[in-house]
Structures are given as structure tokens and as C-alpha cells.
């Protein structure tokens, strides 16, 4: 194509996680997928200065076709800010990642005491549950609702009926997953909500209850039973 274009990001979802807390001896990969015409070049800075191979034992790999920087077996001296600079003759863009190399003993995720907190609202109101997670390694976080089917909280196998409401994914940032919003609340939304955080050591979870009160002058709504989800 003859359409000249300054550099632009082609996959911002892969760049949303800026803070990377990584255990020592692990491999780190930073990506800055980009496009432009002519095809831009990519270079990397560490703490604002040119990042050279001799700056770390074992050097690093740059995969230009994947727009990535790879550092194997990270050590504490690798901590810092890593900036990709993508440029062509029509412009330049950059993106910075922060790397923290964790040396202390990794533990189960720790959830802040008292969160999520019990909440109450009227029908039609809004509510939010907050979950603060501390974890040495990147945790996977889920919000779960304990639901009923045919008036029972438990299935024939004795396990509870659960519904995953929200889970961290490629399109979800850490901040987004820490808060569960429930808009235009109905009586069906009442019940137990659980914030679950897991890492390679184990799983931790805290629960809270939502109480739904009738709105002034409104009849109680009739609600359908939720589906059984394992």
C-alpha cells in the first residue's frame, strides 16, 4: 500500500498489564505489537537508557516479528522500567512496562480483611463489591455467585450451585477485576458473593452477602431460577 502511516499499536490488550511481578529465575516477555507504513522499527530502553545485551548476564532476545523482548532467568538487577520505542519516518510511539523481580518466599494470595464487605440495596439500585488481593506471583481472580436451583443451594453431587460472574482474561485489567459492579439490582441478585484469588501455591477466597430490600411502593418481582453451573 502507498498509504503512509505513523506507527500505531495493533493489539493494546496485550499491553494492558504494565506491572509485572515475576519470581526470580523465571522468563519475562514484554510485547508491543505495532504497525505502520513503512513498517516501523523497534528498540528497547531500560530506565530510559538504551538497553544493551551486555547490560545483563545472558543478554536478551528481541523477536521483531512478534514485537517482543524476552529475558530468561531474571535476577533482582533486572528490576526496572522497560520501554519499547516503535518508530518510522512518520512518527514514534512508546510504551513502558515495570518489572519487579520477586525473591521472597511466594505465598498463597492474601485478601484484604473485611473485603468484600456485606452490602444492601433496594430493588433497582446499584451495588459494588471490592476485593483487594496481594500476591507475589500474578494471581488469577474470579467473582463467584452462590446460586439456587429449585430452591436448593446444592446439586445432587453435594456440591454447591455456582456461577462465575467475572474472571480475569486477556481483556480484563487487574483494576477492573478487583471490583464487581451489579447494576439495577433485582431480588434474584441477593445472596453470597465470593472473590477467589489463586496462584501457583494455592487459592484464597473471601465472601460477602448482598441483601436486597423492596423499593418503596414496588411489588416483589418474580424471578426465574438460575442455571446450574459447576
Amino acid at each position: 500500500s502507498n498509504n503512509k502511516r505513523a506507527p500505531y499499536w495493533t493489539n493494546t490488550e496485550k499491553m494492558e498489564k504494565r506491572l509485572h511481578a515475576v519470581p526470580a529465575a523465571n522468563t519475562v516477555k514484554f510485547r508491543c505489537p505495532a504497525g505502520g507504513n513503512p513498517m516501523p522499527t523497534m528498540r528497547w530502553l531500560k530506565n530510559g537508557k538504551e538497553f544493551k545485551q551486555e547490560h545483563r548476564i545472558g543478554g536478551y532476545k528481541v523477536r521483531n516479528q512478534h514485537w517482543s523482548l524476552i529475558m530468561e532467568s531474571v535476577v533482582p538487577s533486572d528490576k526496572g522500567n522497560y520501554t519499547c520505542v516503535v518508530e518510522n519516518e512518520y512518527g514514534s510511539i512508546n510504551h513502558t512496562y515495570h518489572l519487579d523481580v520477586v525473591e521472597r518466599s511466594p505465598h498463597r494470595p492474601i485478601l484484604q480483611a473485611g473485603l468484600p464487605a456485606n452490602a444492601s440495596t433496594v430493588v433497582g439500585g446499584d451495588v459494588e463489591f471490592v476485593c483487594k488481593v496481594y500476591s507475589d506471583a500474578q494471581p488469577h481472580i474470579q467473582w463467584i455467585k452462590h446460586v439456587e436451583k429449585n430452591g436448593s443451594k446444592y446439586g445432587p453431587d453435594g456440591l454447591p450451585y455456582l456461577k462465575v460472574l467475572k474472571a480475569a482474561g486477556v481483556n480484563t485489567t487487574d483494576k477492573e477485576i478487583e471490583v464487581l459492579y451489579i447494576r439495577n439490582v433485582t431480588f434474584e441478585d441477593a445472596g453470597e458473593y465470593t472473590c477467589l484469588a489463586g496462584n501457583s501455591i494455592g487459592i484464597s477466597f473471601h465472601s460477602a452477602w448482598l441483601t436486597v430490600l423492596p423499593a418503596p411502593g414496588r411489588e416483589k418481582e418474580i424471578t426465574a431460577s438460575p442455571d446450574y453451573l459447576e
Epitope: 515475576v22 519470581p23 529465575a25 523465571n26 518466599s105 511466594p106 505465598h107 498463597r108 492474601i110 485478601l111 480483611a113 506471583a137 500474578q138 488469577h140 474470579q142 463467584i144 456440591l159 454447591p160 455456582l162 462465575v164 465470593t194 477467589l196 489463586g198 496462584n199 501457583s200 501455591i201 494455592g202 487459592i203 484464597s204 477466597f205 473471601h206
Partner: antibody
Amino acid sequence: EVQLLESGGGVVQPGRSLRLSCAASGFTFSSYAMHWVRQAPGKGLEWVAVISYDGSNKYYADSVKGRFTISRDNSKNTLSLQMNSLRVEDTAIYYCVRGAGRGYTYGPDGFDIWGQGTMVTVSS
Amino acid sequence: DIVMTQTPLSLSVTPGQPASISCKSSQSLLHSDGKTYLYWYLQKPGQPPQLLIYELSNRFSGVPDRFSGSGSGTDFTLKISRVEAEDVGVYYCMQYIEAPLTFGGGTKVEIK
């Protein structure tokens, strides 16, 4: 049936390498962290390493750090332990153990399923 | 690292009699989620360890109710109310709160 089956053990000289494998079946392997635990002859249990469900995080015991590498292939339901620069004190039965899953659990969140183990002997 | 200390080293028990094994940790195993991450295993000769008790006091599926776990913080006990011949082997406690995961040295239980 949930099962873990280790292989790759054998007799090796000090300083040499060996690669252990663990084949998982009966559960969604890609949803669980996995561990290696070892037991020297007539001795107690020693945790060796863990890898997260997606392979992004790995931790090692100080006694093997820099020599052993844990890895996984979720497409093949396989866990591996690459052991380099082996020492006489690495002689042990190596067990593959299922760790924590990704979701809500009723019951233990891991360390419930162990393989039968594979014997590694490091001797000159 | 959390150090797990188990006593006694060995135990000889008459069938039908109770047995008790102690385990102490160098740090509290009580987590912020309210659970105590202490596990108990039995390893029978020539077999891998099998889980008996998880999170201090919960019996794993299929484990007879003669096994019970108790304790708090740093002091833990595994009790067998009435020892049977099939209970022989080495018992281990394990902390599952942080890496490196650590085990007690083991208690060998045999029948008189």
C-alpha cells in the same frame, strides 16, 4: 480416574543430566498447578518445584535452583523436570503432585493426587 | 523457610488403642482467609503418600473417621482414636501456606 504417571528415572553419573516426565489423565491438566516432590531412600519428603497452570510462574527449592527446570506441555497433558548437573544427593524417588486448581474448590486445593514415583540414582 | 518439627520419631501401638502425633511449625499457618494450611499424610511401605487431613481438621474423602486433626497457629495434632493394622506406615505433616512447601520429618507407626 485421576492419575499421574512418572517416567524417565534411571541411573546416571554425577554431573550428567536426566529428564523426568509425568503424564496426567482424568482431570483438566491445564487448570492445575503442578509440583515435584522427592524422597531420598529411607528419608523424608522434600518439595522440589512448582509450575503454575499456564507455565508462567515457576518456583524451586534452593537445593535445586539453577540446576533443575520445571516445564509443562498442556496440549499433551505432560509435566517435565529437566535435571542438570546432577549430584549424589539428588538420588531419590521423584513424585509428580497435583497442585491448586483455578476455580472454587470444596475440598483440598491441591496436594491430593500423587503419582507412584520414578527412581533417580546418581552414582559414579 | 518454615520448619516443621514432628514428634515422636516412632510409635508402637496396640490395635484398638489411640495414638497421637504432634507437629510444630516455626511460623503460624493461619492464613488471612481464616484457614490453617496444615496437611497430614500417611505413607505406607512402597507407596506414595496419601492425604488424610487437609486445612488442619478436614478429613479427605474416603478417610475413616478414626483420624482427626486439631491445633491452632503453630501447634498441631493428628489423632487416631483406635489404631488398626492397616494404619501402619510413616505419617507426615506439611505446611501448604508458602513456598518452599515443607514437611515434618515423619513419625513411624507400627503395631505392637
